[in-house]
Interface confidence: medium
């Protein structure tokens, strides 16, 4: 069965200054590849977390995303402000060469 990306929470309500937990799970280990979190969709979407590279000081992962049999891609975003409001997407990429290819979005 083809991998599905599941974001079970349709909305998350968080008080200013608190931590938001954005849940995301995959239904399969295949294909191998990293995940990224975005706010918004389309060409103008904002990268919130990239498993492979970058520095995201407000973001922590719920589990070890680099473990190959991990299917929990949930993240926590600390010190929430009103500016963080929006729709967040968990996106699974398929490992590729030279670049990873977007595979499926929550």
């Amino acid at each position: 069965e083809e991998l599905q990306v599941i974001q079970p929470d349709k909305s998350v309500l968080v008080a200013a200054g608190e931590t938001a937990t954005l849940r995301c799970t995959a239904t399969s280990l295949i294909p191998v590849g990293p995940i990224q979190w975005f706010r918004g969709a389309g060409p103008g979407r904002e990268l919130i977390y990239n498993q492979k590279e970058g520095h995201f000081p407000r973001v922590t992962t719920v589990s070890d995303l680099t473990k190959r049999n991990n299917m929990d891609f949930s993240i926590r975003i600390g010190n929430i402000t009103p500016a963080d409001a929006g729709t967040y997407y968990c996106v699974k990429f398929r490992k590729g060469s030279p670049d990873d290819v977007e595979f499926k979005s929550g």
Partner: antibody, heavy 122, light 107 residues
């Protein structure tokens, strides 16, 4: 070619510290998870620790937890193992090894260093 | 921790013999099992990953099978250069534990 070279081993008294290094070459070090594995004289292999490609995740065997720290400097292509409060049972050859797949761990170790010997003795 | 029980601990066989080593995990590890060869005084070498996949450059006389808790490693025709100790390792759950090893000697 892909190469891992350990250094820093030696003879040390119980309770003292030692830092092992593993210099990597021939591959994009910053993209791979790395392990330390040890082998006591005449014994089998014991997994010690793993660190993710970016250093954000680290895991340890219970036998070294709280005493050993795995770290990496991707700008220097070097893996480290800081060993504190050493015990006689830490005496072993220490190997560094790389994961086969970039950005992931849990696939094993496809390239190993030659090992460096640590002897803990009074 | 997952315990890996490897047997036998040592064996002696003739050149050309079929050699079989077994490894049993204390819980289901799917196919997340590797086999390594270690020659005296040398670092281990990965032979088989994910229970049955031959690492690049490894001779085809080496093979592996199994899933869940029971795994088998086979050398179809033992060669003098195969004298070594062989280890299984589970890479499903941290810590990534090894079996105790099987020392293979020539009769």
């Amino acid at each position: 070619q892909v190469q891992l070279v350990e250094s820093g081993g030696g003879v040390v008294q119980p309770g003292r510290s030692l830092r092992l290094s593993c210099a990597a070459s021939g591959f994009t070090f910053s993209s791979y998870g790395m392990h330390w594995v040890r082998q006591a004289p005449g014994k089998g292999l014991e997994w010690v620790a793993v660190i993710s490609y970016d250093g954000s995740n680290k895991y340890y065997a219970d036998s070294v937890k709280g005493r050993f720290t795995i770290s990496r400097d991707n700008s220097k292509n070097t893996l480290y193992l800081q060993m504190n409060s050493l015990r006689a049972e830490d005496t072993a050859v220490y190997y560094c090894a790389k994961e086969p797949r970039s950005y992931w761990h849990g696939y094993g170790m496809d390239v190993w260093g030659q090992g460096t010997t640590v002897t803990v003795s009074s | 921790d997952i315990q890996m029980t490897q047997s036998p601990s040592s064996l002696s066989a003739s050149v050309g013999d079929r050699v079989t080593i077994t490894c049993q995990a204390s819980q289901d590890i799917s196919n997340y099992l590797n086999w390594y060869q270690q020659k005296p005084g040398k670092a281990p070498k990965l032979l088989i990953y994910d229970a049955s996949n031959l690492e690049t450059g490894v001779p085809s006389r080496f093979s592996g099978s199994g899933s869940g808790t029971d795994f088998t490693f086979t050398i179809s025709s033992l060669q003098p250069e195969d004298i070594a100790t062989y280890y299984c390792q589970q890479v499903d759950v941290l810590p990534y534990t090894f079996g105790g090893g099987t020392k293979v000697e020539i009769k």
